[in-house]
């Protein structure tokens, strides 16, 4: 091998992917208030509704300090695979009675799979242990009746935005870090 | 311009040991994970090790795990690979690469015989 | 042995488009962690070609593709020119190796 000509700088610096990730977490926590607006003004909802397949919440904003880069990042992708998951299913289980939440829901989706894309770069980049995926989970059950799903939809996206917002004070504590 | 630069490669006996460098510039070298790739003489390539950017996880290929080991200094911006117990099969260019990885250096020849 | 499946050898014409496979397995391309092209020109270093399944790094000519499904990916090569002649690598993490893991290698001769 001949002396190295050196390689034009072909993609971000896992500094700026942070900053571009953060970006992209901060548009998606917006996308999934405003659908849980929508969600709210179409189907309003008494109460708090939970779905025993979501995630638990990661942990509160204040136990972060804590946190290691490599347990952040897994948990999150852990965590929003499975939202990623329950939004497929929610948009396959409830496709008309949730069709005027369309296009923003596939909106969503795409963006979710993005942010997962850009998690995975960046563990890879850092060179951080990327371990292995969670046994399949089985099957989501179609929900009992329309009302339902509306209450499947409001937990998801109650839970998502949570878990986004977790997202991004974790993602701005961690860029601190690097 | 990104720049890696690998070193130390040469010839050494069966059983003997090396230390091979890699000089970063061109990037900010503490934010990037590291690897070692080997490439036998026209054969592909095989991953070797990994090092995390703060140098707090180190992962081996099986055929070296034991003998070789991956360390970094952030503040000299280089990368180091000590190869112990060296067989005749580890004869191949080492190539450092950062990131992904996104960038390679031009590699260096290690050559294992008697 | 290499842990990723590559046919060997791919040919083409000038302007012709040729595609080169990957495939894996649960462990890795199957678990959902991105796949990576790399080129090797003649008597030079790997660079990387396709990121992240489907990304093109900057400089990188849009002629180069890439996708994935399932277990496998590909890449795809359009407008073939005599100067992509050189050996074609993919590379995934394996979740089971604790590390990337690389095809065989493609030759691919452009007639």
């Known amino acids: 091998p001949g002396p190295p000509p050196g390689s034009p700088r072909a993609s971000p610096d896992p500094r700026a992917e942070l900053d571009s990730t953060v970006l992209l977490t901060r548009s998606l926590l917006e996308d999934t208030r405003q659908l849980t607006i929508q969600l709210k003004d179409k189907f309003p909802a008494d109460g708090d509704h939970n779905l025993d397949s979501l995630p638990t919440l990661a942990m509160s904003a204040g136990a972060l300090g804590a946190l290691q880069l490599p347990s952040v990042l897994t948990r999150l992708r852990a965590d929003l695979l499975s939202y990623l998951r329950h939004v497929q299913w929610l948009r396959r289980a409830m496709g008309s009675s949730l069709k005027t939440l369309e296009p923003e829901l596939g909106t969503l989706q795409t963006r979710l799979d993005r942010l997962l894309r850009r998690l995975q770069l960046l563990m890879s980049r850092l060179a951080l242990p990327q371990l292995p995926p969670d046994p399949p989970a089985p099957p989501l059950a179609p929900p009992s009746s329309t009302w339902g799903g509306i209450r499947a939809a409001h937990a998801i996206l109650g839970g998502l935005h949570l878990t986004l917002d977790w997202a991004v004070r974790g993602l701005l504590l961690l860029k601190t870090r690097l | 311009e990104v720049q890696l630069l690998e070193s130390g490669g040469g010839l050494v006996q069966p059983g003997g040991s090396l230390r091979l460098s890699c000089a970063a510039s061109?990037?900010?070298?503490?934010?990037?994970?590291m690897h070692w790739v080997r490439q036998a003489p026209g054969k592909g390539l095989e991953w070797v090790a990994v090092i995390s950017y703060d140098g707090s996880y180190k992962y081996y290929a099986d055929s070296v795990k034991g003998r070789f080991t991956i360390s970094r200094d952030n503040s000299k911006n280089t990368l180091y690979l000590q190869m112990n117990s060296l067989r005749a099969e580890d004869t191949a260019v080492y190539y450092c690469a950062a990131g992904v990885p996104d960038y390679w250096g031009q590699g260096t020849l290690v050559t294992v015989s008697s | 042995q290499s842990v990723l499946t590559q046919p060997p050898s791919a040919s083409g014409t000038p302007g012709q488009r040729v595609t080169i496979s990957c495939s894996g397995s649960?462990?890795?391309?199957?678990?959902?962690?991105?796949v990576h092209w790399y080129q090797q020109l003649p008597g030079t270093a790997p660079k990387l070609l396709i990121y992240?399944?489907?990304e093109r790094p900057s400089g990188v000519p849009d002629r180069f593709s890439g996708s994935k499904s399932g277990t496998s990916a590909s890449l795809a090569i359009s407008g073939l020119r005599s100067e992509d002649e050189a050996d074609y690598y993919c590379a995934a993490w394996d979740f089971s190796l604790y590390g990337p893991v690389f095809g065989g290698g493609t030759k691919l001769t452009v007639l």
């Open positions: 992240s399944n489907n």
């Open positions: 649960s462990s890795n391309i199957g678990s959902d962690y991105d």
């Open positions: 061109g990037f900010t070298f503490s934010s990037y994970g």
